[in-house]
């Protein structure tokens, strides 16, 4: 049985151009301990978008709108969105370890695509 | 109706060994984050140990860190602690408690006695 | 560790009164713009039992007299209006970082 589920329910979103994308994730549990970061795109290449532990993302805003009792929301929401932003976002968990945290799940992505800025 | 009924509890003494268990019932005991948290009436409540639902993950503080092992019988609804090296400040009402989502304390157990004394 | 201070100590308040207790956290307990900040209630003799997860959700069951509030690093707990059966000891908890900690309590009884 699974010990914790990386839930991002959207498969993908439309954002128009200069407007706010809102991307969301939920986890089934806190365990194991570790940060969740997001990222865009996957591998090596991978761009980090969000880290609320170290980093500075002017950008990006958290947003936990729905509490649920046997979920924890770690979404988030990207300002002033740009053709440049789009691309694949995913949700990581990672476990704490020692020396470096290690991957532990991964959402299934939520692709973003930004239609034209409306005239 | 969620039960926890912890057992095992008793008197032993400095160094010596002891080990808890607390029996589920009333909810689907394999996808629960369990732990235990101690009480006395000097340091109040205090975290001792939290196990992953499936067993794998175990979280210790450092004043029972070497000492306690935490462990889960998912097929038998069960959950145990082991406590060595035993020591004074170790005697307190010992809970039994669940978490499902591995953040609050959902449900408690009534609760066993362990004092540590010569 | 993150340490947290619960205030008042003890609490007399008149039946059918706010009863306010207040819960610091020497660092925020806040990720993702959740809190993880709980409160529990103890009466004598019995386990804790959970009464509002991570800051200002009411546990099911819980009487709605019962709120929570705060983010960050301070939290408080009213009970509005007080109840007899409101008689006990109420603890916070933050599960934010390992170690998790409790507050040292705040005993309530009627004035």
């Known amino acids: 049985e699974d010990e914790l589920q990386v839930i991002q329910p959207e498969k993908s979103v439309s954002v128009a151009a200069g407007e706010s994308a809102t991307l969301r994730c939920a986890m089934t549990s806190l365990i194991p301990v570790g940060p969740i970061m997001w990222f865009r795109g996957a591998g090596a290449g991978r761009e980090l978008i969000y880290n609320q532990k170290e980093g500075h993302f002017p950008r990006v805003t958290t947003v936990s709108e729905l509490t649920k009792r046997n979920n924890l929301d770690f979404s988030i929401s990207i300002s002033n969105i740009t053709p440049a932003d789009a691309g694949t976002y995913y949700c990581v968990k990672f476990r704490k370890g020692s020396p470096d945290d290690v991957e532990f799940k991964s959402g299934a992505g939520t692709e973003l695509s930004v239609r034209a800025k409306p005239s | 109706e969620v039960q926890l009924v912890e057992s095992g509890g008793g008197l032993v003494k400095p160094g010596g060994s002891l080990r808890l268990s607390c029996a589920a019932s009333g909810f689907t005991f394999s996808s629960y984050v369990m732990s235990w948290v101690r009480q006395t009436p000097g340091k109040g409540l205090e975290w001792v140990a939290t196990?992953?639902?499936?067993?794998?993950?175990?979280y210790y503080p450092e004043s029972v860190k070497g000492r306690f092992t935490l462990s889960r019988d998912n097929a038998k609804n069960s959950l145990y602690l082991q406590m060595n090296s035993l020591r004074a400040e170790d005697t307190a009402v010992y809970y039994c408690?669940?978490?499902?989502?591995?953040?609050?304390?959902?449900?408690w157990g009534q609760g066993t006695t362990v004092t540590v004394s010569s | 560790d993150i340490v947290m201070t619960q205030s008042p100590a003890s609490l007399a308040v008149s039946l059918g009164e706010r009863a306010t207790i207040s819960c610091r956290a020497s660092e925020s307990v806040d990720s993702y713009g959740n809190s993880f900040m709980h409160w529990y209630q103890q009466k004598p003799g019995q386990p804790p039992k959970l009464l509002i997860y991570?800051?200002?959700n009411l546990e099911s069951g819980v009487p709605d007299r019962f709120s929570g509030s705060g983010s960050r690093t301070d939290f408080t707990l009213t009970i509005n209006p007080l109840q007899a059966e409101d008689v006990a000891t109420y603890y916070c908890?933050?599960?934010?970082?390992?170690?998790?900690?409790f507050g040292g309590g705040t005993k309530v009884e009627i004035k």
């Open positions: 991570r800051a200002s």
């Open positions: 408690a669940s978490q499902l989502t591995g953040s609050e304390f959902d449900y």
């Open positions: 908890h933050q599960s934010a970082d390992l170690p998790w900690t």
């Open positions: 196990i992953s639902s499936g067993g794998t993950y175990t």
